[in-house]
Interface confidence: low
């Protein structure tokens, strides 16, 4: 008794798939595979398959049922911190070649990394036009202020809401100041936080307020303090710069906005007699810490003139270095003072219409605002690589 094996039914490819090899007929032990078009994946029921091959059995049936070629679905896109996502292809469409557009919250954030347009690719990942699978970044817009120009010289003015939204109050031993960078860093003076370098959590950081003693402020805490390696405590103020990393990002708004770092071209806005603005809660002419945030507009002083002013006793020779800049009036009366340390001396970049930090309040004569003496500030532009390296590494 003999029997001939039955040929198997001709395999019909699922939509968006094809059979290989194509044969006139398929008999015992013949096999075929299904391959899906780009953007489609093999599914058996609801389970994805890496590959599919069926073999013709003796009874004329295939050993496996035909799979489906199902369109790749990238799934709902991740939420973007300080941003939002919009479905471009259609409401909730997340399948192959669907397009979504990330955007950042207007006014206070701008998109970094790419243009925010992502496409659902065949690998099942939302992918940017540059090929990135990671989310874009909504970076805070820096240097926005309610003050539109540097203005003329006048001192001891009360700041208004939104004038200095980068201003940070640092408490922890002494009162000092800093300036917000991005949304989780504070730029300050090394001497202001030196004692806390090994105990960062002891720093009480406040922002978004004008009144030093107000209970209404945004609280931030320090995760780490980075003091410039070239700073030597109690041996002058060269390299008087530090960064504080906050343990959480702060929410940016009209009262809390980071200051910009200086561009390469920034020195053209910081020449002798150009006006910078210093702000803080430091000592006023009455000898007390200010209750309200104060600011003063002061001109940059010729570096040689400033060096000469601090060459005579009681100041040691070489007190003013190339890493410093000076600002103030020859006649005195307009200056930063104790308690202002670490705050930013800011300048308006008239090309970008953004404020940037040119100096950090560092040191000066014992008597603030003294005639013939000037406030000395850490020259931030000299430290851009140092700042950028720390921020990128941590």
């Amino acid at each position: 008794y003999t029997s001939t094996a039955q040929p198997c039914p001709y395999p019909m490819a699922p939509p968006n798939g094809h059979v290989s090899p194509v044969q006139a007929k398929y008999i015992l032990k013949d096999s075929f595979s299904i391959f899906c078009e780009t953007g489609y994946e093999l599914l058996q029921g609801h389970l994805p398959l890496k590959s599919f091959t069926a073999v013709c059995q003796k009874d004329g049936s295939w050993d496996r049922p035909m799979p489906a070629c199902s369109i790749v679905d990238c799934g709902p896109p991740d939420d973007l911190p300080s941003g939002r996502v919009e479905y471009i292809t259609g409401p909730g469409v997340t399948t192959y070649k669907a397009v979504i557009q990330y955007s950042c919250e207007e006014t206070f954030y701008t998109m970094k990394v790419n243009d925010g347009k992502y496409v659902c690719e065949a690998d099942g990942f939302w992918t940017s036009s540059k090929g990135e699978k990671s989310l874009p970044v909504c970076e805070p817009v820096c240097g926005l202020s309610a003050r539109t120009t540097g203005g003329r010289i006048y001192g001891g003015q009360k700041a208004k809401p939104g004038d200095f939204p980068w201003q940070v109050l640092i408490l922890g031993g002494t009162t000092a100041a800093g300036a917000l960078l991005y949304d989780n860093w504070v730029l300050t003076a090394a001497h202001a936080v030196y004692e806390q370098k090994h105990d960062a959590s002891a720093l009480d950081i406040r922002m978004g307020t004008l009144k030093r003693l107000s209970p209404h402020y945004t609280q931030a805490w320090s995760e780490a303090v980075f003091i410039h390696e070239g700073y030597t405590h109690d041996a002058g103020f060269d390299n008087d710069i530090a960064l504080i990393k906050l343990n959480n990002k702060v929410v940016i708004n009209s009262n809390i906005t980071p200051i910009c770092l200086p561009r390469k071209e920034a020195e053209s806005f910081m020449r002798t007699d150009d006006i910078g603005t210093a702000s803080g809660w430091g000592l006023t002419q009455r000898g007390f810490l200010a209750r309200n945030l104060m600011y003063v507009d002061i001109p940059i002083v010729d570096h040689q003139k400033c060096t000469a002013a601090y060459e005579k006793p009681p100041y040691p020779r070489g007190s003013v270095t190339a890493n410093m800049l000076c600002a103030g009036l020859e006649s005195g009366g307009k200056d930063s003072c104790r308690g202002d340390s670490g705050g930013a001396l800011v300048f308006l970049d008239s090309e970008t219409e953004r404020w940037f930090v040119g100096g950090i309040v560092s040191w000066g004569s014992m008597n603030c605002g003294e005639a013939g003496q000037y406030g000395v500030y850490t020259k931030v532009i000299n430290y851009i690589p140092w700042i950028e390296n720390i921020i990128s590494d941590f």
Epitope: I71, K97, V99
Partner: antibody, heavy 120, light 113 residues
Amino acid sequence: QVQLQQSGAELMKPGASVKISCKATGYPFSTYWIEWVKQRPGHGLEWIGEILPGSDNTNYNEKFKGKATFTADTSSNTAYMQLSSLTSEDSAVYYCARRTTATRAWFVYWGQGTLVTVSA
Amino acid sequence: DIVMSQSPSSLAVSVGEKVTMSCKSSQSLLYSSNQKNYLAWYQQKPGQSPKLLIYWASTRESGVPDRFTGSGSGTDFTLTISSVRAEDLAVYYCQHYYTYPWTFGGGTNLEIK
């Protein structure tokens, strides 16, 4: 509203190449496949292939591989089809059309057609 | 490739008459997983571009008059015009979109007597 505007008629010599354009307006250009269809008198409609603008994705009907080449410029929202080594067999009206979605390959939107005549 | 065959190639009818035209595919266009037939119908009037009438074999495109009806499943499909009007003078094409390459039928030329 969605519109596909094709370039004008072309009279070409045998052996030459021609490049037809299809400018899309009214929708996100890089999201939808652009199809190309040939129509010769008495021969009905033939699908040449498709391109997904903004990517390298193209699918060609085997019959037209080597004859047609698709490109797209997302800055101008324009798709192009180049036909090479023209013969009289290539004399036809060529349409661009837009697929409905990635999975739905029927064509709701069509260009007005470009007549290509190949004659010595 | 899937071959699409249409019949008749031409027919002439009077206004108000019912018309049916056929489209056959060389393999089934019914996909068992979703029970959908991957077939569309187009109308092409003289000097114009084709216009979509029907997709999924029987779903009318928005704006298409309800006198146009698509039916059929598997390999046999029909387009019916319940009451022909003068403006229906056109060539009607079927197209499958089951797998690459998409192919069209040869067309049915509808003439008005």
